[in-house]
């Protein structure tokens, strides 16, 4: 692979449908602008879940309607995906691109298998 | 003598703490009495979860206080483990022994990683 990107093999979403994992990259240069993309792979289909560009030392900014939030610390990005349902179970791949200054580097992790279990509905309170 | 035993790699317990999986064995002979044991491996510690002996074509009979239930169909055993909590997450290994008639055969599967997520408590109904 190109740039090395590490992420956990398995993560369980909690009963509120929230899953968090760390995506860590080995930076070959002194990037100041980094782009992080989360991709979901299921049945050989890959779809983009969310993406954010951030300046080193600053917060990650996802779009307002994104299901992702995150923070960065050095070469580590702490990603949280919310609103997950059982049908969202799948392999979530972290892609990291060092956008600026040159040179451009990119790398992808092996993916984090996120398991999601739908909660039982609470009994009606009569 | 060794025997091939197959079981799924991963299973999720549902929100009520119930997990089910199939344990299938390649029977080298015409066994009439079979013993199935479920073992849990966590932190290199192996503990017995439950065990049952059954006559081919009959029901599996676990002890009354067992957390396991099961049914058999040919060389397949359908196992259900209940009362699971998040702390019970681990590798559950299926061990099969052909007890009678001789020769004795024994095999163990590679284990099923069972993931358990504790549900959120329902709000109090005032």
């Amino acid at each position: 692979k190109a740039m090395h990107v590490a992420q956990p093999a398995v993560v369980l979403a909690n009963s509120r449908g929230i899953a968090s994992f760390v995506c860590e990259y080995a930076s070959p240069g002194k990037a100041t602008e980094v782009r992080v993309t989360v991709l979901r792979q299921a049945d050989s289909q890959v779809t983009e879940v969310c993406a954010a560009t951030y300046m080193m030392g600053n917060e990650l900014t996802f779009l307002d309607d994104s299901i992702c939030t995150g923070t960065s610390s050095g070469n580590q990005v702490n990603l949280t995906i919310q609103g997950l349902r059982a049908m969202d179970t799948g392999l979530y791949i972290c892609k990291v691109e060092l956008m600026y200054p040159p040179p451009y580097y990119m790398g992808i992790g092996n993916g984090t298998q996120i398991y999601v279990i739908d909660p039982e509905p609470c009994p009606d309170s009569d | 003598k060794a025997m091939h035993v197959a079981q799924p790699a991963v299973v999720l317990a549902n929100s009520r703490g119930i997990a089910s999986f199939v344990c299938e064995y390649a029977s080298p002979g015409k066994a009439t009495e079979v013993r199935v044991t479920v073992l849990r491996q966590a932190d290199s510690q192996v503990t017995e979860v439950c065990a049952a002996t059954y006559m081919m074509g009959n029901e599996l009979t676990f002890l009354d206080d067992s957390i396991c239930t099961g049914t058999s169909s040919g060389n397949q055993v359908n196992l259900t483990i209940q009362g699971l909590r998040a702390m019970d997450t681990g590798l559950y290994i299926c061990k099969v022994e052909l007890m009678y008639p001789p020769p004795y055969y024994m095999g163990i599967g590679n284990g099923t990683q069972i993931y358990v997520i504790d549900p959120e408590p329902c709000p109090d109904s005032d």
Epitope: P28, G29, V46, K95, P103, M106 | -
Partner: antibody
Framework: EVKLDETGGGLVQPGRPMKLSCVAS????????MNWVRQSPEKGLEWVAQ??????????HYSDSVKGRFTISRDDSKSSVYLQMNNLRGEDMGIYYC??????WGQGTLVTVSA | DIQMTQSPTSLSASVGETVTITCGTS??????LNWYQRKQGKSPQLLIY???NLADGMSSRFSGSGSGRQYSLKISSLHPDDVATYYC?????????FGGGTKLEIK
């Protein structure tokens, strides 16, 4: 101004060795993974070898066609990268370019393998 | 190894036209694709990196798109200066294979 200057090309007999050198200037050499790419009329552009930088422990990677015959090395203090080519074959002929993470390219040096 | 299938191998277009070159890959390369322009007798020049990003100093008439296993390079409002051979390259993993090239000529 970014510059990459390759030297060391020329005519060589099959089976003989040759060493190419590339000196870089105008960019932070130590931040770049350095590569050799060759161009021939038969094969178009063909990636040959890569040497990564210090954070990647100077890992080296080679195309299958040169593995075991070519060796890439670098000297960050001289902003230089080298390609030692042994047991040269006819199919190794072409223009050899030195490139920094494919962003910057040298003018190339021609390697001709002939008896 | 990742195979790169570039098409067409050559194309001829008039000044002012828009042309598209495509590059297919044998497996998903997650946007790890560069495009290069090589003019006759010159070194290759990086044109597009990471599938969609325009390299410094290159005209905004060039644009890259695509994901997964299908990528394309679009050249809008063709100039005589665009006569060159264009190459795609996998930069996700070694070996960093190139496409066969597309030779662009002006009618």
């Amino acid at each position: 101004e970014v510059k990459l200057d390759e030297t060391g090309g020329g005519l060589v007999q099959p089976g003989r060795p040759m060493k190419l050198s590339c000196v870089a200037s105008g960019f932070t050499f130590s931040d770049y993974w350095m590569n050799w790419v060759r161009q021939s009329p038969e094969k178009g552009l063909e990636w040959v070898a890569q040497i990564r930088n210090k954070p990647y422990n100077y890992e080296t990677h080679y195309s299958d066609s040169v593995k075991g015959r070519f060796t890439i090395s670098r000297d960050d203090s001289k902003s230089s990268v080298y390609l030692q080519m042994n047991n040269l074959r006819g199919e190794d002929m072409g223009i050899y370019y030195c490139t920094g993470t494919f962003a910057y390219w040298g003018q190339g040096t021609l390697v001709t393998v002939s008896a | 190894d990742i195979q790169m299938t570039q098409s067409p191998t050559s194309l001829s277009a008039s000044v002012g036209e828009t042309v598209t070159i495509t590059c297919g890959t044998s497996e998903n390369i997650y946007g790890g694709l560069n495009w290069y322009q090589r003019k006759q007798g010159k070194s290759p020049q990086l044109l597009i990196y990471g599938a969609t990003n325009l390299a410094d100093g290159m005209s905004s008439r060039f644009s890259g798109s695509g994901s997964g296993r299908q990528y394309s390079l679009k050249i809008s409002s063709l100039h005589p200066d665009d006569v060159a051979t264009y190459y795609c390259q996998n930069v996700l993993s070694t070996p960093y294979t190139f496409g066969g090239g597309t030779k662009l000529e002006i009618k």
